[in-house]
Amino acid sequence: EPPTACREKQYLINSQCCSLCQPGQKLVSDCTEFTETECLPCGESEFLDTWNRETHCHQHKYCDPNLGLRVQQKGTSETDTICTCEEGWHCTSEACESCVLHRSCSPGFGVKQIATGVSDTICEPCPVGFFSNVSSAFEKCHPWTSCETKDLVVQQAGTNKTDVVCGPQDRLR
């Protein structure tokens, strides 16, 4: 009696269980009563990542440099290419189909978390006692200069965008 189900890594065709093609190979012809399944390796820049009965391999993903992408891990006959973003850019989606430039933190704000290939820069306002006078994707808020440790006095108060200005102490005669 013809089978109604087949073992793992097999498929049912013409009332017969045929072996699936291994990852990295595509189906050329189904098995018969007298012959095994015929499979062929995927061509260059192609892959199949599962045991399959596909007649065509998939093309490796193209990491388009015009979209800010680069190859992180090159594909093989069994795996697809993995794209990531060039430095200074991050993915716009989980699938990482394109990238956008990392955001910079404006003066008065510092970097709380540096951007990665998949997440943007996180900025935070500089709290009292700290400042940032640049627009940057890397710079944290810097602490105001401590005039006292230099034996100086504050001549101009700091802000979230400027450092304090220190000056000499008035000497009483």
Epitope: E44, S45, H60, Y62, C63, P65, R70, V71, Q72, Q73, K74, I82, T84, E86, E87, G117
Partner: antibody, heavy 116, light 110 residues
């Protein structure tokens, strides 16, 4: 961000030698790393590559003569049994040398001299 | 794969134009995995062109890469004294083990 090669020195033929490429400012889990060499007065020669998951690929003539491995911040090139033909400056390069990325980083190279 | 670079040496006058050819024995990955490098004595190679035709950061627009598949050209127009160097093409392929460099072209500026 930088890559820096070290370990180059004068060795006698047959004495194994390991060169180390130390990286800083980026992660080896995000970049493939390539080894290239250049004999004095000669052209550039591609030796092999270690990708982000640690798979290694070698030039056909280099298989068995070189071994590439890595840790979290270093990439090693072992010359298994050096001959005088292996006298060269060895370069460590971030990324696939022919890829569509413009952010490749080359080290300054380390000189290996094989002589008896 | 074999990358054949021609000529092996070329002389150029200041202000002139130089073309270097790079022929691959098989198509490079995605038809554009071809880079051009410039090397001066005692220095590591410097990336000029990647993706067959994209100019690397800081490289003058006098350098131009063209081609696709297995045939590529580097053209240097308005040649300057500073362009005296050896130029290499480098190809990446579907199989990493095929990766390689061309034999190099020495550009001598008169």
């Amino acid at each position: 961000q930088s890559v820096e090669e070290s370990g180059g020195r004068l060795v006698t033929p047959g004495t194994p030698l390991t060169l180390t490429c130390t990286v800083s400012g980026f992660s080896l889990s995000s970049y493939a790393m390539t080894w290239v060499r250049q004999a004095p007065g000669k052209g550039l020669e591609w030796l092999g590559i270690i990708d982000t998951i640690g798979s290694t690929y070698y030039a056909s003539w280099a298989k068995g003569r070189f071994t590439i491995s890595k840790t979290s911040t270093t990439v090693d090139l072992k010359i298994t049994s050096p001959t005088t033909e292996d006298t060269a400056t060895y370069f460590c390069v971030r990324d696939y040398i022919g890829s569509t990325s413009g952010k490749k980083l080359w080290g300054r190279g380390t000189l290996v001299t094989v002589s008896s | 794969a074999v990358l054949t670079q021609t000529p092996s040496s070329v002389e150029a006058a200041v202000g002139g134009t130089v073309s270097i050819s790079c022929q691959s024995s098989k198509s490079v990955y995605y038809k554009n995995w071809l880079a051009w490098y410039q090397q001066k004595p005692g220095q590591p190679p410097k990336l000029l062109i990647y993706g067959a035709s994209t100019l690397a950061s800081g490289v003058p627009s006098r350098f131009k890469g063209s081609g696709s598949g297995a045939q590529f050209t580097l053209t240097i127009s308005d040649v300057q004294c500073d362009d005296a160097a050896t130029y290499y093409c480098a190809g990446g392929y579907s199989s990493d083990s095929d990766t390689g460099f061309g034999g190099g072209t020495e550009v001598v500026v008169k």
